[in-house]
């Protein structure tokens, strides 16, 4: 509603713009005929302070001048940067019901002059780009500030553009619309830049710089690849540029990668050969171009190709391992397994393996070809047989990787002695030994070989081994390992023709078992009494068992229980005791010991011997 | 424990065709690798087929291209399919299920079902 401005008018002296820390004074006037009608000596002027729209101050103590009825006069101070509003209102006092009435209001602003721009930095993008210039501006004015961006060069060439700061914008880029042609290439361009407001100017050092200086190139477009022949390794790298481009910069990676190969190339013409790519590999390639070997900038890397390189026939060898049963009088069941090649070695998708079994002496060979890590097949158990098995993919098969298939645990002599196991951490086992003390032929390695003490199908759940060379005597083995499962372990010495081995059985971690055993049945022979039992359930044993313990007591007794300790065997389900008294009434009950402790105790079976037992 | 029954034995003439099944039961959540042997009088026990998890199979020599071993995981059974029977091929059949733990190989057999092959 001081829009109008009907009843009086506003003024500010020095002016409604401001530096800050300065005073201003703010008059207020009623027009001839305006006031508070009857009684003119009742006006009275009052004037308001707004910032952003909320009253903050009534200025009644700052009158500095008083025209009864008139006019006021009041002086402000401490005014913050920024704008301040201030409304004269005539308060008719004789009027106790009517509120203040607006007579007319000023906006005041505060702010400083600008600073000199600094920091001008000019860019052209590409030939037939325009140039376009930034700087720093400075403090903020808090006031409408107008900057003039004025380029000069050659032949009288003169250019500027124009743009303001203000509360809602800002300033510091501008696009003169002209374009600098590389037949400039030599010459030299000032640029300067003139920040204008209320309270003052400034002016920045004139910026000198030539074409080469401020033209950046345009990122290289239209990025392809051909590999050559269906290489995998080898590739034209092809791109679309600017004319005048002279060097550029490729950078590729394999996409799980973290670090760049950076090449330069000269002169390319949009076109450069690779030949240390990685094949069947997903590649990410970027290029960047400059107009200067010397002077001039990098354009911005263009956008990324992503392609994977060609297939190659697989390198490097499978590593094999086999596990061999007797299934009947004359027959022996062998089973290979192998690891797969990691993607450097297979290079491409592995299509099936080759598998070749063959009788040495007789020449008796069993091909056969599978998608699976493991083969299986039933052979004589006469003759000395060899396995090979190589890797096929689309463009050809590894080389075959070949195995004797002996008795792997057949020679004492060569197995290897102290075989310990020691728990790393939760999922890794030390395992180490020392070397045969009298084998009759050379170590060619060791194989380091595990398998969870779980029931598992023997083509479902493979063995897991590790190579290890003849002069090495520890493995750390952790493929596959899980706390709180025993697994049987074993280490095989093996020469060209023989084998031997040791075994121990080991945890990563371990807890007391959940339970004891179950006492099934307990029988009276011979004077002594045995004890049958079914094992604890193997997610109940919570580790490697080291061996159980049978309790027994007289019944109703309140001294301590005996105990005999046996040493754990999987195989063994019994064992007998003599030192019970004939026709005394005795509880029994059965306990499981792992390196972490004993298990709560199993059942409790009762049973009173009969005959004569010692 | 694991409990294996054969079923489908006969006397049959040269040159039929016979069908043996075996189910499994019990703890059997293990046994992928399942057998057939045959023993005949007064010979010792041979192995004639077997079939691995990913159903691989393997056979005797003298049997191969007449037997054919398969398996119904659903149903928890293996069969073997006689064909083109011969009176050599006169054996009690056994079904045999192998599982592993750790190293020790644990082997669980049926009772056998009389196969008599007349000339």
């Known amino acids: 509603n001081i829009d109008v401005c009907k009843l009086g008018t506003v003024t500010v002296q020095p002016a409604p713009v401001i530096p800050l820390g300065s005073a201003a004074n703010i008059s207020c006037s009623l027009n001839p005929k305006q006031g508070c009608s009857h009684y003119p000596s009742s006006n009275e002027l009052i004037l308001l302070k707004f910032v952003n729209d909320v009253l903050v101050e009534n200025l009644h103590g700052k009158k500095v001048h008083d025209h009864t009825g008139h006019s006021s006069t009041f002086q402000v101070t401490n005014l913050s940067l920024g704008m301040t509003l201030f409304v004269c209102k005539l308060n008719c006092s004789n009027s106790q019901k009517k509120p203040p009435v607006p007579v007319c209001g000023v906006e005041i602003s505060v702010g400083v002059a600008p600073e000199p721009p600094q920091n001008i930095s000019c860019v052209q993008e590409g030939e037939n780009g325009t140039v376009a210039c930034s700087w720093n501006s400075g403090k903020v004015t808090y006031l409408k500030t107008n900057y003039t961006l004025q380029l000069s060069g050659p032949n009288n060439l003169t250019c500027q553009k124009q743009c303001f700061s203000d509360n809602r914008q800002n300033c510091n880029r501008l696009d003169l619309g002209i374009n600098l042609s590389p037949d400039l290439a030599e010459s030299r361009f000032i640029v300067r830049v003139t920040a204008i407001n209320d309270l003052g100017n400034s002016s920045s050092l004139p910026h000198t710089f030539t074409f080469l200086d401020i033209v950046i190139p345009l990122p290289p477009w239209d990025i392809r690849i051909n590999f050559l022949n269906a290489s995998g390794s080898r590739g034209t790298l092809q791109w679309e540029d600017e004319g005048q481009v002279v060097l550029n910069q490729l950078r590729y990676q394999p996409l799980n990668s973290t670090s760049w190969n950076m090449v330069n190339a000269t002169n390319a013409k949009g076109k450069y050969d690779l030949r240390d790519l990685r094949p069947f590999t997903e590649y990410e390639f970027q290029i960047s171009s400059k107009l200067h070997l010397s002077g001039g900038s990098w354009s911005n890397w263009s956008e990324s190709l992503r392609t994977r390189t060609p297939e190659e026939e697989p390198v490097g060898i499978l590593d094999i391992w086999y596990m061999k049963q007797d299934i009947d009088y004359d027959r022996q069941q062998i089973s290979l397994f192998w690891k797969s090649l990691n993607p450097s070695e297979a290079r491409g998708k592995i299509l099936h393996y080759q598998v070749t079994l063959q009788e040495v002496t007789k020449k008796t060979t069993l091909q056969n070809t599978t998608r699976h890590t493991s083969w299986t097949r039933v052979i004589p158990r006469t003759g000395a047989w060899t396995a090979s098995v190589s890797a096929a993919n689309s463009k050809g098969a590894s080389a075959p990787t070949h195995i004797n298939i002996v008795d792997l645990c057949g020679t004492g002599l060569l197995a290897p002695h102290q075989v310990s196991a020691k728990s790393e951490n939760m999922d890794n086992i030390l395992v180490t030994w020392q070397p045969p003390k009298k084998a009759d032929s050379a170590v060619r390695e060791y194989i380091v070989e595990w398998r969870a003490l779980q029931p598992g199908s023997i083509t479902k759940f493979p063995p897991h081994w590790l190579r290890i060379p003849p002069d090495n005597m520890s493995a750390l083995i952790s493929e596959n390992i899980k706390p709180y499962i025993c697994y049987e372990i074993r280490v095989h010495a093996l020469s060209e023709s023989q084998g031997g081995c040791s075994s121990i059985r080991g945890d990563s971690k371990h807890k007391a078992p959940v339970s004891g055993p179950h006492i099934t049945a307990i029988t009276e022979k011979k004077e002594r009494l045995f004890i049958s039992w079914t094992h604890i359930p193997f997610p109940e044993q919570r580790g490697c068992i080291l061996h159980y313990r049978i309790y027994w007591k007289e019944r109703d007794s309140t001294a301590q229980p005996e105990l005999c300790e046996i040493q754990y065997r999987r195989s063994q389900n019994s064992h007998p005791i003599s030192s019970l008294q004939p026709r005394v009434t005795y509880v029994l009950w059965m306990t499981a010991v792992t390196a972490a402790g004993e298990s709560p105790q199993g059942n409790e079976r009762e049973f009173c011997p009969q005959g004569k037992a010692n | 424990q694991v409990q294996l029954q054969e079923s489908g034995g006969g006397l049959v003439q040269a040159g039929e065709s016979l069908r043996l099944s075996c189910t499994a039961s019990?703890?059997?959540?293990?046994?992928?690798?399942m057998y057939w042997y045959r023993q005949a009088p007064g010979k010792q026990r041979e192995f004639v087929a077997y079939?691995?998890?990913?159903?691989?199979?393997n056979y005797l020599d003298s049997v191969n291209g007449r037997f054919t071993i398969s398996r119904d995981n659903a149903k928890n059974s293996v069969y073997l399919q006689m064909n083109s029977l011969k009176p050599e091929d006169t054996a009690v059949y056994y079904c045999?299920?192998?599982?592993?733990?750790?190293?020790?190989?644990?082997?669980?057999w049926g009772q056998g079902t009389q196969v008599t092959v007349s000339s």
């Open positions: 019990g703890s059997i959540f293990a046994i992928d690798d």
């Open positions: 079939i691995t998890a990913t159903n691989s199979a």
């Open positions: 045999n299920a192998k599982q592993i733990v750790g190293f020790q190989i644990d082997e669980y």
